[in-house]
């Protein structure tokens, strides 16, 4: 069953009009794919390729499609029930805690610790410790060995942008 | 394969109401809206309204709100349509038809309702 | 209400020729255009969606176009079997609705 989005999760500017008391929940509502209009009788279209909703919606305007930023692949186009999926670039991933840029991939593990993880679109390598086998905090080290790794292939999104 | 199996010819008098169904197979009722539409001979099409089977959420064309009643009944994947006070404006065909929310991918074969006393 | 004109009710054409039936809006519908082939006693099937998105086993002869107010169904080499009513529906704001209509008839 769809996720509904109410009133109450929307911007002051967002939401529709008063509307008469709903006899279910989504009586009212858009389908994904759709906003309300402004008198709250009609579902208007979002348009292809510029805006999308995801959810039965009182929204009086779709959601604006996310374009991709340079470093960044289309790895699937913006629909208008689906945001674009952007995924950073081979040899680059997007942390959690950095979420609006794609970092570059350290190219090895710093000396005493060996490589457990390839670089993904959203992890950078992976090195543990020989001896303790316990991962490396993921600061960038003063010196590197010479020992490389090979990006990752992308797999799945790292983030949807929105 | 995707089916929409309509109920037969209806041939009722002036103020009564009839209730047509729509029986699915071959896909996820509760995935795809339903949509009913008129046809009356001769002429061209006219959306009546939509019913999600997935949260029943229905909408209606403002001309059919209160003249038509859509229903859902998961359990057996058929939709329904309840047309009350009958005249002979309302003598059509009604055609069943799934979808995505604005155009309709498959349809049923059609009931003809006869409104005549 | 959108309303949908079809300003042709009659084409007439031959097997082989190239046919366009169109269909103007009252207003812009931004692409959210469907057409439907309908034959005499039979149930109307859906070709095109969102103005150029040919449905599922619809032949590659038919192709949709058009933007803003202003559609196209075009029937590059037409085919006996394609005679029939061709309808135009806006998707784009409800209630949905459908053009008067086109008769394709085949020479």
């Known amino acids: 069953e769809s996720a509904l989005i109410t009133q109450q999760d929307l911007a002051p500017q967002q939401r529709a009009a008063p509307q008469q008391k709903r006899s279910s929940p989504s009586e009212g509502l858009c389908p994904p794919g759709h906003h309300i209009s402004e008198d709250g009788r009609d579902c208007i279209s979002c348009k292809y390729g510029q805006d999308y909703s995801t959810h039965w919606n009182d929204l009086l305007f779709c959601l604006r499609c996310t374009r991709c930023d340079s470093g960044e692949v289309e790895l699937s186009p913006c629909t208008t029930t689906r945001n674009t999926v952007c995924q950073c670039e081979e040899g680059t991933f997007r942390e959690e805690d950095s979420p609006e840029m794609c970092r570059k991939c350290r190219t090895g593990c710093p000396r005493g610790m060996v490589k457990v993880g390839d670089c993904t679109p959203w992890s950078d390598i992976e090195c543990v410790h020989k001896e303790s086998g316990t991962k490396h905090s993921g600061e960038v080290p003063a010196v590197e060995e010479t020992v490389t790794s090979s990006p990752g292939t992308p797999a799945s999104p790292c983030s949807l942008s929105g | 394969e995707v089916q929409l199996q309509q109920s037969g010819p209806e041939l009722v008098k002036p103020g009564a109401s009839v209730r047509m169904s729509c029986k699915a197979s071959?896909?996820?009722?509760?995935?795809?809206?339903i949509h009913w539409v008129k046809q009356r001979p001769g002429q061209g099409l006219e959306w009546i309204g939509w019913?999600?089977?997935?949260?029943?959420?229905?909408k209606y064309s403002e001309k059919f709100k209160g003249k038509a009643t859509l229903t859902a009944d998961k359990s057996s994947s058929t939709a329904y349509m309840q047309f009350s006070s009958l005249t002979s404006e309302d003598s059509a065909v009604y055609f069943c038809?799934?979808?995505?929310?604005?155009?309709?991918?498959?349809w049923g074969q059609g009931t003809t309702l006869t409104v005549s006393s | 209400d959108i309303v949908m004109t079809q300003s042709h009710k009659f084409m007439s054409t031959s097997v082989g020729d190239r046919v366009s039936i169109t269909c103007k809006a009252s207003?812009?519908?931004?692409?959210?255009v469907a057409w439907y082939q309908q034959k005499p006693g039979q149930s109307p099937r859906l070709l095109i969606y969102?103005?150029?998105t040919r449905h599922t086993g619809v032949p590659d002869r038919f192709t949709g176009s058009g933007s803003g107010t202003d559609y196209t169904l075009t029937i590059s080499s037409v085919q006996a079997e394609d005679q029939a009513l061709y309808y135009c529906?806006?998707?784009?704001?409800?209630?949905?609705?459908f053009g008067g209509g086109t008769k394709l008839e085949i020479k």
């Open positions: 019913i999600y089977p997935g949260n029943v959420n229905t």
């Open positions: 207003q812009d519908v931004s692409t959210a």
């Open positions: 529906q806006q998707h784009y704001r409800t209630p949905w609705t």
């Open positions: 071959g896909y996820t009722f509760t995935s795809y809206f």
């Open positions: 969102w103005a150029s």
């Open positions: 038809a799934r979808g995505e929310a604005g155009y309709f991918d498959y």
